[in-house]
Interface confidence: medium
């Protein structure tokens, strides 16, 4: 066995093993997505997180899982069975993915102001229509999750929520905000949420009560809600995690480039090996 053949054999099994790993990973991601879609309650208790945007994540996970499984399967079978067409398809899919990521990167860096404004507009729309449209629960859950994780409230200010008619206090009633705005660590009282979740929720109908993240909390006089708007929170988060984000993106990009190089190398050299083997047959 020549050096080239052993090298190709090594690449072949390397591609097979790595793609097998990604196939398993993809199937796990897909299973999680399906689990969330079928049984949200058991998933929430398993993860132990509040304000998880399940509706969006279930679909994102399922689609990502299928996509990962598909690409990995092409790589696995293509490498193991030494099928040029599958390896070529695998290379093409990775190239498409890589090109998409590059394009997105360029768009994000050049169109930052427009993207920020679009995000603000989406958030404002979500805030304005909060708890009124069953079609918008995915966006609402996602925004609740952002507020909960980034410890912020509203876009510019927590008061952004007071523009929502169903959340506006009248007379002796306090203004209201989604419970994801509530800073539970700011109070020693573990029962605070029980106290502030409004008994008047029934007024908002089944829409608001149909999901945990639409729980609406009163704002006490000395409020325990996050004081910072999420615009600042997101900026801080991006600033603090910029190196990690860039690192992950570069890592994924290099991994894709690596697999692309190996697959095209294997693809192009399979003929030479076959020709040589035919000579000795």
């Amino acid at each position: 066995m020549s050096a080239q053949e052993s090298c190709l054999s090594l690449i072949k099994y390397f591609l097979f093993v790595f793609n097998l790993f990604f196939f398993v990973l993809g199937s796990l991601i897909f299973c999680f997505g399906i689990w969330i879609l079928i049984d949200k309650t058991s998933f929430v208790s398993f993860v132990g997180l509040a304000f998880v945007p399940l509706q969006i994540w279930s679909k994102v996970l399922a689609i990502s899982g299928i996509f990962t499984m598909g690409i990995a399967l092409l790589g696995c079978v293509g490498a193991l069975k030494e099928l040029r067409c599958l390896l070529g398809l695998y290379f093409g899919m990775l190239l498409l993915l890589f090109a998409t990521q590059i394009t997105l990167g360029i768009l994000i860096s050049t169109q930052r102001a427009q993207l920020e404004r679009s995000l603000r507009d989406v958030v404002e729309k979500t805030i304005q229509k909060y708890g009124t449209n069953p079609e918008e629960t995915a966006a609402e859950e996602s925004w609740d999750y952002v507020q909960f994780q980034l410890r912020c409230c509203g876009w510019h200010y927590p008061q952004d929520w007071f523009q929502v008619l169903i959340l506006r206090g009248n007379g002796s009633e306090a203004h209201r905000v989604p419970c994801s705005c509530y800073n539970l660590s700011a109070t020693n009282d573990s029962t605070i949420l029980d106290k502030v979740i409004l008994p008047q929720l029934s007024r908002l109908g089944h829409l608001a009560r149909s999901r945990h993240s639409a729980d609406i909390c009163a704002v006490p006089a000395e409020s325990h809600i996050y004081r910072e708007g999420c615009a600042q929170g997101l900026q801080k988060w991006l600033h603090n995690n910029l190196i990690s984000i860039v690192g992950i993106c570069l890592g994924v990009g290099l991994l894709e480039l690596g697999f692309m190089t190996l697959s095209i190398f294997l693809c192009r050299n399979l003929d030479h090996v076959y020709n040589r083997l035919a000579r000795y047959r």
Epitope: R117, R120, A231
Partner: antibody, heavy 119, light 107 residues
């Protein structure tokens, strides 16, 4: 920190026009609307209009419509208010103030620009 | 246009006093009311927005309340730096309108 710095005092003749500038710093200029408010001596504050610096959309008080023009230069993070066909009752301090949205409070104000209309 | 009528127009009080300024709108403004403080020769400063929410950094002695057409600004214990003119404003519909102001003076 957030700062709104307005141009200096102006003395203008009746019938002429005046352009007051307001330079913003310490925040993303296109993220907040810019209001213009008039305060004549001994009078209540009067809202003149506002601009959304992101797209240049303006909303004016009908009382000033036709005479007031609000513009912006995003590259210089500056908003402008031009008032034309000036008369003696336009003698006032003009303030710029930022607001996250149109229908919202004005959380930061400029120092004010005194415009005196005198022949 | 929505008219905002403030009362009283002027008010004399002493340090430590509890002071209440009222603002009446000519129609329901659904808590879309701000309160501003202005000292002579200075620009106005936001105190309260959405009728009852104190702006960042505003002392807790300032509080706002109200609904519908009637709104109130209360200063629980007057401090020397609180003597100024106070304005209410509605941002419910354009044109946004201010009250005529309440001048708070030292007795």
């Amino acid at each position: 920190q957030v700062q709104l710095v307005q141009s200096g005092a102006e003395v203008v003749k009746p019938g002429a026009s005046v352009k007051v500038s307001c330079k913003a710093s310490g925040y993303s200029f296109t993220d907040y609307n810019m209001y213009w408010v008039k305060q004549a001596p001994g009078q209540r504050l009067e809202w003149m209009g506002y601009i959304d610096p992101y797209n240049g959309d303006t909303t004016y008080n009908q009382k000033f419509k036709g005479r007031v023009t609000i513009t912006r230069d995003t590259s210089a993070s500056t908003a402008y208010m031009e008032l034309s066909s000036l008369r003696s009752e336009d003698t006032a301090v003009y303030y710029c103030a930022r607001s996250p949205y149109g229908h919202y409070a004005m959380d930061y104000w400029g120092q004010g620009t005194l415009v005196t209309v005198s022949s | 246009d929505i008219q905002m009528t403030q009362s009283p127009s002027s008010l004399s009080a002493s340090v430590g006093d509890r002071v209440t300024i009222t603002c009446k709108a000519s129609q329901d403004v659904s808590t879309a009311v701000d309160w501003y403080q202005q000292k002579p020769g200075k620009s106005p400063k936001l105190l309260i927005n959405w009728a009852s929410t104190r702006h960042t950094g505003v002392p807790s002695r300032f509080s706002g309340s109200g609904s519908g057409t009637d709104y109130t600004l209360t200063i629980s214990s007057l401090q020397p730096e609180d003597f100024a003119t106070y304005y209410c404003r509605q941002h419910y519909s354009t044109p946004f309108t201010f009250g005529q102001g309440t001048k708070l003076e030292i007795k």
